[in-house]
């Protein structure tokens, strides 16, 4: 089932999945000046077995500027270093992503994406937030969203992050303490299409159980 | 049910201190972040302050020229709130409110007044 | 800071109108703007959240849009419990700021 809204935008921060539940889509788009190639697909679709999961699918963009041209789905590594791409590194994680049952892993970029990777998001899928460059936690309870189903809606739970600038008059007395998981509260929204998400910083966040920290390059 | 049960009405001479509490239950405490909001009578409503009740943490309105201490106890779910060389124009209702993730002041307490007089 | 300036201060209206109060911020907020209702002797109630988000529970006459500096709530069709006044909050920057608040009366 999929998730009928994006997950909860909370001021001067960002979300990012850890890995990606079956069923999981991402639009195959082109940046500016690319297209997909006629045949290609329109989205990338995490499938998979009791043992394996991966994505089906591969996107692929060409020139809109030439008819026939089609170009390679991997980059070679040079060319991965000018992207913008999400390197995983979640050395504390409890599970390691790659290993978690019926989940994929971030999809490797393709030649010529966009700057910015729109998912679909299915019941029980579950994203970290983080403060942006030049701003950090004044508060961080738990500071992850899930995709519920409630009474045949589905709804993303509250992430509890409030990201303060550097410069403001903020007090920070101490070093956050390591995160207890928490219990739940209720809901003051029911909310709950499509999500972006746009990773360009640099920073540490805190997962439900541990600190896990993902950085992405500027492209 | 979630509940904020602030204290009782207090009556304050011009310069003293008022600490106000709000004592919260039907969540866990250390989650969510707690504001304050002043509303003088007839007034508007002014933003105070905030505490991460997880970590201490602080931010507060430079209008109120520090004079205004916000603090949490965890071992008692209640956040306070101290507001120091009081003058008349400080008589006001003070609301404890909670942060909600994307948006904030979902829950409010029933709000404190304080009168400051002569 | 941020300053919100709301208009108008107050006004009449009859029930089944339609009203919309306006809110003005002193630069780009992001749409991180709540309009709250408060009745006398009450604490505040969020009706809109994120310029346009209605809160679960609030009746579907209200309704928020607006972008970049400026926003509006809108009720659709007056009912005579909506006599309050209300306020926007934006809650992009701290110190978070509010209007300076719309009385709003039942003619």
């Known amino acids: 089932e999929l998730c009928d809204d994006d997950p909860p935008e909370i001021p001067h921060a960002t979300f990012k999945a850890m890995a990606y539940k079956e069923g999981t889509m991402l639009n195959c788009e082109c940046k500016r000046g690319f297209r997909r190639i006629k045949s290609g697909s329109l989205y990338m679709l995490c499938t998979g077995n009791s043992s394996h999961s991966s994505w089906d699918n591969q996107c692929q963009c060409t020139s809109s500027a030439t008819r026939n041209t089609t170009k390679q789905v991997t980059p070679q590594p040079e060319e991965q270093k000018e992207r913008k791409t999400t390197e995983m590194q979640s050395p504390m994680q409890p599970v390691d992503q790659a290993s978690l049952p019926g989940h994929c892993r971030e999809p490797p970029p393709w030649e010529n994406e966009a700057t910015e990777r729109i998912y679909h998001f299915v019941v029980g899928q579950m994203v970290y937030y983080q403060c942006v460059q030049g701003y950090r936690a004044l508060h961080r309870g738990p500071a992850e969203s899930v995709c519920k189903m409630t009474h045949g809606k589905t709804r993303w739970t509250q992430p509890q992050l409030i990201c303060t600038g550097e410069m403001e008059t903020s007090q920070f007395p101490g070093e956050e303490k390591p995160q207890a998981s928490p219990e739940g509260r209720p809901e003051s929204e029911t909310s709950c299409l499509v999500t972006t998400t746009d990773f360009q910083i640099q920073t540490e966040m805190a997962a439900t159980m541990e600190t896990s920290i993902f950085t992405t390059e500027y492209q | 049910e979630v509940q904020l049960v602030q204290s009782g009405a207090e009556v304050k001479k011009p310069g003293a201190t008022v600490k106000i509490s709000c004592k919260v239950s039907g969540y866990t405490f250390t989650d969510y972040a707690m504001h304050w909001v002043q509303q003088a009578p007839g007034k508007g409503l002014e933003w105070m302050g905030v505490?991460?009740?997880?970590?201490?943490?602080?931010n507060y309105n430079q209008k109120f020229k520090g004079r205004v201490t916000i603090t949490a106890d965890t071992s008692t779910d209640t956040a306070y709130m101290e507001l120091s060389s009081l003058r008349s124009e400080d008589t006001a209702v003070y609301y404890c409110?909670?942060?909600?993730?994307?948006?904030?002041?979902?829950?409010w307490g029933q709000g404190t007044l304080v009168t400051v007089s002569s | 800071d941020i300053q919100m300036t709301q208009s108008p201060s107050s006004l009449s209206a009859s029930v089944g109108d339609r009203v919309t109060i306006t809110c003005k911020a002193s630069q780009d907020i992001t749409s991180y703007l709540s309009w709250f209702q408060q009745k006398p002797g009450k604490a505040p109630k969020t009706l809109i959240y994120r310029a346009n988000r209605l809160v679960s529970g609030v009746p579907s006459r209200f309704s928020g849009s607006g972008s970049g500096q400026d926003y509006t709530l809108t009720i659709s069709s007056l009912q005579p419990e909506d006599m309050a006044t209300y306020y926007c909050?934006?809650?992009?920057?701290?110190?978070?700021?509010f209007g300076q608040g719309t009385k709003l009366e039942i003619k």
């Open positions: 505490i991460s009740t997880y970590n201490g943490n602080t």
């Open positions: 409110a909670t942060s909600y993730g994307n948006y904030p002041f979902d829950y």
């Open positions: 909050l934006q809650y992009d920057e701290f110190p978070y700021t």
